[in-house]
Amino acid sequence: LRLLDHRALVCSQPGLNCTVKNSTCLDDSWIHPRNLTPSSPKDLQIQLHFAHTQQGDLFPVAHIEWTLQTDASILYLEGAELSVLQLNTNERLCVRFEFLSKLRHHHRRWRFTFSHFVVDPDQEYEVTVHHLPKPIPDGDPNHQSKNFLVPDCEHARMKVTTPCMSSGSLWDPNITVETLEAHQLRVSFTLWNESTHYQILLTSFPHMENHSCFEHMHHIPAPRPEEFHQRSNVTLTLRNLKGCCRHQVQIQPFFSSCLNDCLRHSATVSCPEMPDTPEPIPDYMPLW
């Protein structure tokens, strides 16, 4: 988890002087509780936005937006703590809005936004906005949380972001797999425009089961520049096992931008349909 660019982050708006600060996610009001604390945020919204860095890279970011409740507690509102927790790693990143002037009621509801948390493809986050100071131990909670799942790199809009392109999202191998005679598979795919090697991973399964009955790895050397975007054809020999008929072919590229952590593409060949042929009736009936 990180913030997009460390340029001056702004939270000031007409009628409010505000500064954005790094936070340890442990606000001082936890340790030194206050008697009077503000109410919780209202209408917390998390949206996926896309933002360019100063270098021109495009990243997915969490756009966080919330409003204040229209009660007198805004007189005691000193700021807000924004927390983003990545659920699969428990990594947390926080920033603090520090209000440098007192809030006053005005003709429209106070609204705040922040769009600088960079999020990763196919990751889920819990976003929390805590009004500050935080409540006393038995006080009513004054935070709001929402979960938010970022689409993976196959999503049309995500595909063109820098993290996805770095993992090979623009490469479409257009894999075709056909079954040949003599227990062979013919795999064909389009090479990318990089002189890097590939690996074909074949895993075979019985018709209705998910434990493999055959595994094979095939190495494809780096293509020459004149072979870029051309089709590569590989014939794989299968083990002659009856019923080991469902084949998953996975192609792993080793692009320089992602090395051994590039996006893999796969195709599956199903078992052939069994014809519903009736039992043959014998020409004569045995008499015993």
Partner: nanobody, 127 residues
């Protein structure tokens, strides 16, 4: 014009099944997560189920888990809700909704994350 049109509701006996459909138009359907939300007579809105843009993840309210299945067909711009073992408490107006953002907010705290709603289809479970 951005539009969601639900169909498939009706009167059904307890224990029976029903399949709701939602036809989407006017936006890039396979960019967005979609949800089903219901409103029982005289009650508030209740989130029922949600599905990510590619069907990679589905979530359900505890009250329908194991009985309802959400699915989508991006080629047909359609969202579905297969309902089995229907109960009288499933009687409601069922709405198909589109998520405002490209991300996915799964769960019952998400009803304010939707920007487009259908007109609803009524499901009545009664003997």
């Amino acid at each position: 014009e951005v539009q969601l049109v639900e169909s498939g509701g009706g009167l059904v006996q307890p224990g029976r099944s029903l399949r709701l459909s939602c036809a989407a138009s006017g936006f890039t359907f396979d960019d967005y997560a979609m949800h089903w939300v219901r409103q029982a007579p005289g009650k508030g809105l209740e989130w029922v189920s949600g599905i990510t843009w590619n069907g990679g993840r589905m979530d359900y309210a505890d009250s329908v888990k194991g009985r309802f299945t959400i699915s989508r067909d991006n080629a047909k711009n359609s969202l579905y809700l297969q309902m089995h073992s229907l109960r009288t408490e499933d009687t409601a107006l069922y709405y198909c909704t589109k998520e405002r953002s490209l991300g996915y907010c799964g769960g019952d705290s998400c009803s304010d994350a939707f920007d487009i709603w259908g007109q609803g289809t009524m499901v009545t479970v009664s003997s």
